[in-house]
């Protein structure tokens, strides 16, 4: 049975330019984690297996990097990324935990109400 | 000003398929998420997703998939909720409400468009 | 999915009175940043739903300032502080800070 549950960094607004962590963490398991894949609707973003360690699509190359922990960090962010990310854990003997993100990115000159949520 | 425009009311039959439109007005469209909610029983208020026309992204509640579809026609600032495989449960007022940027709220909403599934 | 509850589900009211609506949350409403996404609604009889408060307290555009929201983590709080006829409705709040994002079950205000 599935007990675990996945806890997100929650919805995030950014800045275009800027960076963001998008981080999920699965709890209430004793299940082990074999690996973490975060996508964005059809596209791979990165693995982190627990044997091999992480592995970024050669398309996000420039932009994504690991961590922290289980986490990613997507840099110069365009208003093209806007989107919903996914944060899959693939465990043992549980199975496939799923959580969700939705990251929204402002145009500088738009930010409205002084909205300017990216990592410095 | 800020308008959302939505497709009149429909009685369909159970098993049907059917699509609501809301056009929008007054705002650079491509700039904002779209979404759709659901009223049943006349109080209920439930997200069904959205749709960010700059790239067509996409978001769903769960609880939904398979029975919506949310699409984007730039070109008409107009989006699109498909329904599909109506069943008694889905007769309901659906909203379309434009987000808020920065604050995942929904500021300027449509003006309902009521769907009765009755055979 | 977060489950959002309001209470009371019936407000009772004489105009002029000073009210409040809670809403709390399954899960804590701050996003990693610190920034939280609650909002709430007034659905008047055959209108469409419009927009309170966004961002807890931020009232919007053309919202009288006798509605005021506070809160933080999972409490929140809409308070009218002089009720006029046209406050009368349901009123909603809205988590947007998870996937996906959960309305409260109503609140009537009502006259007494």
């Known amino acids: 049975m599935m007990t675990g549950t996945i806890e997100t960094t929650g919805n995030i607004s950014a800045e275009k330019g800027g960076s963001i962590i998008l981080q999920c963490h699965l709890s209430s398991t004793t299940a082990q984690v074999t690996q973490v894949n975060w996508e964005q609707q059809d596209q791979l973003l990165a693995i982190c297996n627990a044997d091999l360690g992480w592995h970024i699509s050669p398309s996000f190359k420039d932009r994504v990097a690991p961590g922290p922990g289980l986490g990613l960090t997507l840099q110069s962010l365009t208003v093209n990324d806007t989107g919903e990310y996914f944060c899959i854990y693939h465990t043992y003997p549980d199975g496939t935990y799923t959580g969700r993100i939705f990251l929204e990115v402002l145009e500088s000159s738009v930010a409205e109400h002084g909205a300017r949520f990216q990592i410095p | 000003e800020v308008q959302l425009q939505q497709s009149g009311p429909e009685l369909v039959k159970p098993g049907v398929s059917m699509k609501i439109s809301c056009k929008a007005s007054g705002y650079s469209f491509t700039g904002y998420t779209m979404n759709w909610v659901k009223q049943s029983h006349g109080k209920n208020l439930e997200w069904l997703g959205l749709i960010f026309p700059y790239n067509s992204a996409t978001s769903y509640n769960q609880k939904f998939t398979g029975k919506a579809t949310i699409t984007v026609d730039k070109s008409s600032n107009t989006t699109y909720m498909e329904l599909f495989s109506l069943t008694s449960e889905d007769s309901a007022v659906y909203y379309c409400?434009?987000?808020?940027?920065?604050?995942?709220?929904?500021?300027?909403w449509g003006q309902g468009t009521s769907v009765t599934v009755s055979s | 999915d977060v489950v959002m509850t309001q209470t009371p589900l019936s407000l009772p009211v004489s105009f002029g009175d000073q009210v409040s609506i809670s809403c709390r949350s399954s899960?804590?409403?701050?996003?990693?940043?610190?920034?939280?996404?609650l909002s709430w609604y007034l659905h008047k009889p055959g209108q469409s739903p419009h927009l309170l408060i966004y961002g807890i307290s931020n009232r919007f555009s053309g919202v009288p300032d006798r509605f005021s929201g506070s809160g933080s983590g999972t409490d929140f709080t809409l308070k009218i502080s002089t009720i006029k006829p046209e406050d009368l409705g349901m009123y909603y709040c809205l988590q947007g800070i998870h996937q996906p994002w959960t309305f409260g079950g109503g609140t009537k205000l009502e006259i007494k």
């Open positions: 899960q804590s409403l701050a996003n990693s940043y610190g920034n939280t996404y």
């Open positions: 409400a434009r987000g808020l940027r920065g604050f995942f709220a929904l500021d300027y």
